[in-house]
């Protein structure tokens, strides 16, 4: 079988509040009921895990309480939101999708979404 295809936008600009959202869509070769989604950040060949969630098809994604990610799922599409981003967090955010159950296991890795984060300029002190 070929690698499971995972599609995500090439570029996203975070909001001034440090929030970035993007869609991760996967072409499921079978009828998965349990899916694991992991967001990885790649910068200068270093890869770190940003967040991960396992969900049952038709149910909400559940990230850990202290996670900077939230998300919703609809069919083979996951809508991901990452918050608390700062300029230093600019990088390539890669969506990794694993079809955990039922067997066989499938793994797909997206080509990444380049998220640009610009720290807002501080408001100048008013003289009034």
């Amino acid at each position: 079988c070929k690698a499971m295809h995972v599609a995500q936008p090439a570029v996203v600009l975070a909001s001034s509040r440090g929030i970035a959202s993007f869609v991760c869509e996967y072409a499921s070769p079978g009828k998965a009921t349990e899916v694991r989604v992991t967001v990885l950040r790649q910068a200068d060949s270093q890869v770190t895990e940003v967040c991960a969630a396992t969900y049952m098809m038709g149910n909400e994604l559940t990230f850990l309480d202290d996670s900077i990610c939230t998300g919703t799922s609809s069919g083979n599409q996951v809508n991901l939101t990452i918050q608390g981003l700062r300029a230093m967090d600019t990088g390539l955010y890669i969506c990794k999708v694993e079809l955990m159950y039922p067997p066989p296991y499938y793994l797909g890795i997206g080509n990444g979404t380049q998220i640009y984060v610009i720290d807002p300029e501080p408001c100048p002190d008013s003289d009034f």
Epitope: C1, S45, L107, I109
Partner: nanobody, 126 residues
Amino acid sequence: EVQLVESGGGLVQPGGSLRLSCAASGFSSDYYDIGWFRQDPEKEREMVSCIRSSGGSTKYADSVKGRFTISRDNSKNTVYLQMNSLRAEDTAVYYCGLAPISPVHAVCNQHYFGYWGQGTRVTVSS
């Protein structure tokens, strides 16, 4: 369905050699990373060595550099790990892993692996 089948493990004396083989099937992409990882009961799974299918970029753990050599035979969809000058600390279960990556992905990063073989045990002891 992706299948990775390892062979070549066994018992060897310190200073000896072994060659591990991993035969991959059920995966038709031209681009992937494939490599060897090891794990013993007290530690997490660690990458030993890895090779990229296209271009042949390789990566080695510091602890095996100069002793282990990874190679591949694309016509047989097989990857090999030649292990020389084996030490007691090389004792572990060795797993073959595959990562279905593309050129944008960092070479041989453990986060991208997900397909695993059943493992082959290597014991280095006198």
